[in-house]
């Protein structure tokens, strides 16, 4: 103990009262007012606590300190007196700071500063909004992507800083009386073709599309090599039969003379002469096949190659030429039996039937046209009886299914095994050259020589081989039936067709369908 009678063990933040007692300093408190044991402590009194008697007044905050407290002005306020701290409401001189006046650049670009009690806000200019991550920064509202759809569907929205425009799309123009830019702009498609605003080459036909146009080759013309059709810069050339030339490796004066005629017709050809040119080509083909001359001395395989080449080329040339014909039905026939039936129409929704002496073809008009092709729809059928001479002994390649069927219902091949051509060879074509998988089948009715009793007939088409030759095939064609001198074929593609008689011997007749006379 202290000789002066003061306790030496008083806890921190306390002072002794006498030799056996202590009291907490001002701003501190203990469990009891007088501390009698060194175990007790003095804790800071929080004068700023809710139940405290301290009141700092408005626009201010109370800050507790060790053993005391301070009153300070709240953020956004400052003391008029200049004193940073004070002790009670009577000393409070806090008033609002006008941040907008202090710092005119507070709201940066595109915003106006608005003072509020203790703070400020930024009011964005029209066409701007506050950035969520920086509430003091105004950014441009993109009206075009905000989902407001401020523009008419005939225009496209163009965002500007603080605003937007509704502009006509390329190839569109404001409707009469409409502005071009404000949000009430309404536009319409410019018909570049009728207004003369297109740049189509004279070898093409202008075709208006929504918001644009394209240039398509005139009927009977084709795109220049390497230039696609249906573009703004398409340039076409007259279809001058340039691809229909003698097949390589075939030496025949008769064939050369035929192709000389074809090339002459090609050189002189003009779209207005389509009808005459078709007739001249068929006349030349009819004459060639009536008197094949040295073609008949060629090996069989070469004869088949020539036939394949003639059929393929004829189809392409007739398709091209017929697009220049006016609407209607044409029938031409020639001395050796070559026959052409052709129907040209603006597309109509019905079935078309082409009748010839030895063949009838029936199919839907909607097969004829490629979608989007502006030209007329053409359906054509050529009967070429003379082609049979060149196709004698041509091979037949059967699908495994039909091969098996023939072997099951027949004893097997007889004699030399080559099928006999019963009918004329016919070639069918459309203005649409994509005819490998017709959405609706084509039906052919062939008239032909009598079928030898107990022999089966086959509906076949000429499949052009990659070697430039080809063979008879049945894929995609079914034989609906045959009755003596008439056979009906149903096919899902177009090509050159015929009816063959297979040299098989019938094993058995189905007793159920045996005719009772």
């Amino acid at each position: 103990q202290d000789s002066r009678g003061c306790a030496r063990w008083c806890p921190q933040d306390s002072s002794c009262v006498n030799a056996t007692a202590c009291r907490c300093n001002p701003g501190f408190s203990s469990f009891s007012e007088i501390i009698t044991t060194p175990m007790e402590t003095c804790d800071d009194i929080n004068e700023c606590a809710t139940l405290s008697k301290v009141s700092c007044g408005k626009f201010s905050d109370c800050w507790n300190t060790e053993g005391s407290y301070d009153c300070v002005c709240s953020p956004g306020y400052e003391p008029v007196s200049g004193a940073k701290t004070f002790k009670n409401e009577s000393e409070n001189t806090c008033q609002d700071v006008d941040e907008c006046q202090q710092n005119p650049r507070l709201c940066k670009s595109y915003g106006t500063c608005v003072n509020t009690l203790g703070s400020y806000t930024c009011q964005c200019l029209p066409g701007f909004k506050l950035k969520p991550e920086d509430p003091k920064l105004c950014t441009d509202v993109n009206e075009c992507t905000s989902g407001q759809n401020p523009c008419h569907s005939s225009t496209h929205c163009l965002n500007n800083v603080g605003s937007y425009q509704c502009r006509c799309r390329p190839g569109w123009q404001p409707i009469p009386g409409s502005p071009n830019g404000p949000n009430n702009t309404v536009c319409e498609d410019v018909d570049e073709c009728s207004s003369g605003q297109h740049q189509c080459d004279s070898s093409t036909v202008c075709f208006n599309t929504v918001g644009s146009y394209s240039c398509r080759c005139r009927p009977g013309w084709k795109p220049r090599h390497g230039i696609p059709n249906n573009q703004k810069d398409t340039v076409c050339e007259d279809m001058t039969f340039s691809t229909w030339t003698p097949p390589p490796g075939v030496h025949s004066q008769t064939l050369s003379r035929f192709f000389d005629k074809v090339q002459d017709l090609g050189r002189d050809y003009k779209p207005g002469l389509a009808n005459n040119t078709i007739q001249s080509i068929l006349q030349a083909l009819d004459e060639l096949l009536e008197a094949p001359g040295d073609l008949e001395t060629l090996p069989r395989l070469q004869q088949h190659c020539v036939a394949s080449h003639l059929l393929d080329g004829l189809e392409d040339v007739l398709r091209g030429l017929s697009k220049n014909l006016s609407n209607g039905l044409l029938n031409f026939s020639y001395p050796a039996g070559t026959e052409l039936s052709l129907e040209v129409q603006k597309q109509v929704d019905r079935s078309v039937t082409l009748r010839q002496n030895q063949a009838v073809m029936q199919l839907d008009w909607n097969q004829a046209q490629k979608s989007g092709d502006p030209g007329p729809s053409v359906v054509g059928l050529v009967s070429i009886p003379g082609m049979g001479k060149l196709l004698a002994e041509a091979p037949l390649v059967l699908e495994p299914e039909k091969q098996m069927l023939l072997h099951e219902t027949h004893q097997g091949l007889l004699q030399d095994g080559s099928p006999i051509l019963l009918s004329d060879v016919i070639s069918a074509f459309l203005s649409n050259n994509d005819t490998q998988n017709l959405s609706s089948p084509v039906t052919f009715t062939f008239s032909h020589r009598s079928v030898i009793p107990r022999q089966k007939v086959l509906c076949v088409f000429w499949e052009h081989g990659q070697n430039g030759c080809g063979h008879w095939a049945t894929t995609g064609c079914s034989t609906i039936g045959t009755r003596d001198t008439s056979t009906i074929c149903r096919c899902t593609h177009l090509s050159s067709f015929a009816v063959l008689m297979a040299h098989y011997d019938v094993q058995e007749e189905d007793p159920v369908l045996t005719v009772i006379t």
């Epitope: 029936q362 039906t443 079914s478």
Partner: antibody, heavy 121, light 111 residues
């Protein structure tokens, strides 16, 4: 004796599926075109689909195209009709019928007794 | 709506002859000789009676005959008998994607 026996019919909800079978006997099944023909209660006959002897060629009525699939298993002498996305208007007796044994002739010389398909919720 | 048109019903007395017509278009009946006729008794499967316009399968009575003129085919039953009472359907090959079309059926009543 030629026999065609259909099975697999029953009650199904709209949008559901069924697979019909037709067991063939008494003839060389693999040599014949086969067909399905249906008949709604109290109504006429409607051709549905056909398949060639080896199964390579198939064809469907427009009303079932894309929903029905015809197939065959020549080893089991069985014809099938897989029917998906069924509608109330598909309710009918489904007959399996034999076509020609060589040509694709449009007449049917033997028919099964049929199996009833009912599409209803 | 059937593709081929048949009368809904016909009737005749035993021993009489009746004719059922079947009218189509040039794309079916008129275009091809592939008209068939089927007989169907109530609750039974159809039976082929005539194929290719006028041919009878074996086992079919020669009282049944078929013919065609233009776009209309006909089935004639002579010497009508009680067992002939049934529904009769015509069918034809068609050049459309449908392949074969049927008539709506004709109910034959033997009085």
């Amino acid at each position: 004796e030629v026999q065609l026996v259909e099975s697999g019919g029953g009650l199904v909800q709209p949008g559901g599926s069924l697979r019909l079978s037709c067991a063939a006997s008494g003839f060389t099944f693999r040599s014949y075109w086969m067909h399905w023909v249906r008949q709604a209660p109290g109504k006429g006959l409607v051709w549905v689909s056909r398949i060639s002897s080896g199964g390579s060629t198939t064809n469907y009525a427009d009303s079932v195209k894309g929903r029905f699939t015809i197939s065959r298993d020549n080893a089991k002498n069985t014809l099938y009709l897989q029917m998906n996305s069924l509608r109330a208007e598909d309710t009918a007796i489904y007959y399996c019928a034999r076509g020609d044994n060589y040509y694709d002739s449009p007449y049917f010389d033997y028919w099964g007794c049929g199996t009833l398909v009912t599409v209803s919720s | 709506q059937s593709a081929l048109t048949q009368p809904a019903s016909v009737s005749g007395s035993p021993g009489q002859s009746i004719t059922i017509s079947c009218t189509g278009t040039s794309s079916d009946v008129g275009g091809y000789n592939y008209v068939s006729w089927y007989q169907q008794h109530p609750g039974c499967a159809p039976k082929l009676m005539i194929y290719e316009v006028s041919y009878r399968p074996s086992g079919v009575s020669n009282r049944f005959s078929g013919s065609k003129s233009g776009n209309t085919a006909s089935l004639t039953i002579s010497g009508l008998q009680a067992e002939d009472e049934a529904d009769y359907y015509c069918s034809s090959y068609t050049s459309s994607s449908t392949y074969v079309v049927f008539g709506g059926g004709t109910k034959l009543t033997v009085l």
